[in-house]
């Protein structure tokens, strides 16, 4: 069960996680950024590599608003999607449109989430309701996982990787804003 039991309207249901790195910087103008991440050292020969760490896959960054019932996040969140075929790291293109994706003829390597992070989002609700907040789990990094014919889809959920726990910082508690201010911001957000 774990976090999976938290069923969020506009957020993918994500299995429970360990710890997370710092969130990626928020994108400013809703542009999607695609980049191929290098997942390890280059292989000795592109078709002989056997070590998962020698494979890499693409991490796509994009921004979206989180919705919760009639409410919507005040700001978009930056989300990461694990995409594409895994291949030897040195053969992957640096950006979309440069180079060709390598397709393995042997074992199947799948690009799957590796680490997650939880991000608090402030929700703006219509009608001047009290400000509400929600925590969403977002993919923080991707990895290649080697699948054998004995693996099935459920075994892709291998997300127990631990990252350093971020320092617990305290910030002053934001005061509840007036209904008018809340409503105005909601209208502006749309």
């Amino acid at each position: 069960q774990g976090w999976q039991a938290f069923k969020n309207d506009a957020t993918e249901i994500i299995p429970e996680l360990g710890e997370y790195p710092e969130p990626p910087p928020e994108l400013e103008n809703n542009k999607t950024m695609n980049r191929a991440e290098n997942g390890g050292r280059p292989p000795h020969h592109p078709f002989e590599t056997k070590d998962v760490s020698e494979y890499s896959c693409r991490e796509l960054h994009f921004t979206r608003y989180v919705t919760d019932g009639p409410c919507r996040s005040a700001k978009p969140v930056t989300e990461l999607v694990c995409s594409g075929q895994c291949g030897p790291a040195r053969l992957l293109p640096n950006a979309i449109g440069r180079g060709k994706w390598w397709r393995p003829s042997g074992p199947d390597f799948r690009c799957i989430p590796d680490r997650y992070r939880a991000q608090r989002v402030q929700l703006l609700c219509p009608g001047g309701e009290a400000p509400r907040a929600r925590k969403v789990r977002l993919v923080a990094s991707c990895k290649c996982k080697r699948l054998t014919r004995f693996h099935n889809q459920s075994e892709l959920k291998d997300f127990g990787t631990e990252a350093a726990r971020p320092q617990k910082g305290r910030k002053p508690r934001p005061r509840a804003r007036s209904a008018k201010a809340n409503q105005a911001e909601l209208e502006n957000a749309y």
Partner: antibody, heavy 118, light 107 residues
């Protein structure tokens, strides 16, 4: 498996304080909001407040403001609720609950009975 | 504070019956209402939030409706495990408040 395990029953004198603990397992407490709800014998539910363990943010019901303190230890994934200046009407079962929002209570502890009696 | 008034406070019904519980808010709470089920000696369990959204794993015989000040929880065909006390909760404005509860008993 998500589990919230609360500390045992307490008997307190009027004017004293009580501190109830709630150990969360199944996910890191810092990724949740922690809520406290109480229920007097034979009565309904009463929301006391919530806290965000990650940043120490809190929201308390005005009725308990100044008497309640909600804290967490993220290293042990344990939440605490301390209620001071106890009176007989504070006799109740105190529940911790957790969720991904500040407004709904997805998982609950088993409850801790606090009896205030002279 | 927003008052949530539930009715009836108790009702007797048989297995298979259709049961309706109502909750009236003292002011407009939009759709910010949740419903909980509580069995004797146990902690409450979340069933529905945002008036009509069923929590994952909750049987589809439970449904919620309403908006503004009037809300309804319906159990389309009462099952033996549904005999319990049901509470509505508003989260439109602080402090979050619960209704007084409706006890569903076996007839």
């Amino acid at each position: 498996q998500v589990q919230l395990v609360q500390s045992g029953a307490e008997v307190k004198k009027p004017g004293a304080s009580v501190k109830v603990s709630c150990k969360v397992s199944g996910f890191p407490i810092k990724d949740t909001f922690q809520h406290w709800v109480r229920q007097a014998p034979g009565k309904g539910l009463e929301w006391m407040g919530w806290s965000d363990p990650e940043i120490g943010d809190t929201e308390y019901a005005s009725k308990f403001q100044g008497r309640v303190t909600m804290t967490e230890d993220t290293s042990t994934d344990t939440a605490y609720m301390e209620l001071s200046s106890l009176r007989s009407e504070d006799t109740a079962v105190y529940y911790c609950a957790t969720g991904d929002t500040t407004y709904k209570f997805d998982f609950w502890g088993q409850g801790t009975t606090v009896t205030v009696s002279s | 504070d927003i008052q949530m008034t539930q009715s009836p406070s108790s009702l007797s019904a048989s297995v298979g019956d259709r049961v309706t519980i109502t909750c009236k808010a003292s002011q407009d709470v939009h759709t910010a209402v949740a419903w909980y089920q509580q069995k004797p000696g146990k902690a409450p369990k979340l069933l529905i939030y945002y008036t009509s959204r069923l929590l994952s794993g909750v049987p589809s015989r439970f449904s919620g409706s309403g908006s503004g000040t009037d809300f309804t929880l319906t159990i389309s065909s009462l099952q033996p495990e549904d005999f319990a006390t049901y509470y509505c909760q508003q989260y439109s404005d602080y402090p979050w408040t619960f209704g007084g509860g409706t006890k569903v008993e076996i007839k």
